[in-house]
Amino acid sequence: PSMTLEPNKDLRPGDTVTITCSSYQGYPEAEVFWQDGQGVPLTGNVTTSQMANEQGLFDVHSILRVVLGANGTYSCLVRNPVLQQDAHSSVTIT
């Protein structure tokens, strides 16, 4: 998956950021999990949407809205529930 961060500049502890995790052309619909740098699940303020294309493959976008701490690592894990395959990506904000 790919990740984007907004705002992505001039950040301070206390800022609210939006982290978007995107994965494309999967089948079937994926499961998305978020966790912090210690592996603690992040379940609040998560919005996940999935959309099928003409081929019936799914694009997934999951948005985590989080208040930054002093240092933070945020990871998203995209799981194929049938194949039990995981793909993950993370961003560290210092």
């Epitope: 907004e6 705002p7 500049k9 001039d10 301070r12 502890p13 206390g14 609210t16 950021v17 939006t18």
Partner: antibody
């Protein structure tokens, strides 16, 4: 060229609210922070808060948390600050400013609006 | 909150003199300090960012220095158009804060 144009003079009654505007042009509105700063007559500058219009991320100086509400309208590239429950001590000039990347990884308030004078009086 | 203390409150200088303005932070702010010039009835203008970097178009007579808690703005040879208030501000941590300003008058 980057410009920030603020709304005109406001004369308001105690207890009322006022909404100030800051119309921007000449840069990508959603990609930089907008700051709001208060200056009472003959005084220094006081930071109220800032908003990142791209995702409506805001941070307020605790002192102004119950006083100011920052919003942004992407379609018109305009930032707004609403001031509530106005008192005489809210009489001041209010500036908006862009938090620009003046050099790679260096940020500062590089462009300022002309200021809006707010007078609270009965 | 980090307190930024500027001194002196005001000063009166003759044309061509060297001017030194001080700004002290109540705790370490690294080099996250900017200086702003505000002429009468105008909005502030950025002079110095990152404690020592002159902003585009700012005359070379303006120099910023310092780090951690002690910062200085120097005008090497003051000109008539330098009549203004000078504000230092930190953006190291929330809430961002400014000093109370130094008013520069010309004799």
């Amino acid at each position: 060229q980057v410009q920030l144009k603020q709304s005109g003079i406001e004369l308001v009654r105690p207890g009322a609210s006022v909404k100030l505007s800051c119309k921007t042009s000449g840069y990508i509105f959603t990609a930089d922070w907008i700051y709001w700063v208060k200056q009472r007559s003959g005084q220094g500058l006081e930071w109220i808060g800032r908003i990142y219009p791209g995702v409506d991320s805001t941070y307020y100086n605790e002192k102004f948390k119950d006083k100011a509400i920052l919003t942004a309208d992407k379609s018109s590239s305009t930032a707004y600050m609403q001031l509530n429950s106005l008192k005489s001590e809210d009489s001041a000039v209010y500036f908006c400013a862009r938090g620009g990347e003046v050099r790679r990884d260096f940020y500062a308030l590089d462009y300022w609006g002309q200021g809006t004078s707010v007078t609270v009086s009965s | 909150n980090i307190v930024m203390t500027q001194s002196p409150e005001s000063m009166s200088m003759s044309l061509g003199e060297r001017v030194t303005l001080s700004c002290k932070a109540s705790e370490n702010v690294g080099t996250y300090v900017s200086w702003y010039q505000q002429k009468p009835e105008q909005s502030p203008k950025l002079l110095i960012y990152g404690a020592s970097n002159r902003y585009t178009g700012v005359p070379a007579r303006f120099t910023g220095s310092g780090s951690a808690t002690d910062f200085t703005l120097t005008i090497s040879s003051v000109q008539a158009e330098d009549l203004a208030d000078y504000h230092c501000g930190q953006r190291y941590s929330y809430p961002f804060t400014f000093g109370s300003g130094t008013k520069l008058e010309i004799k």
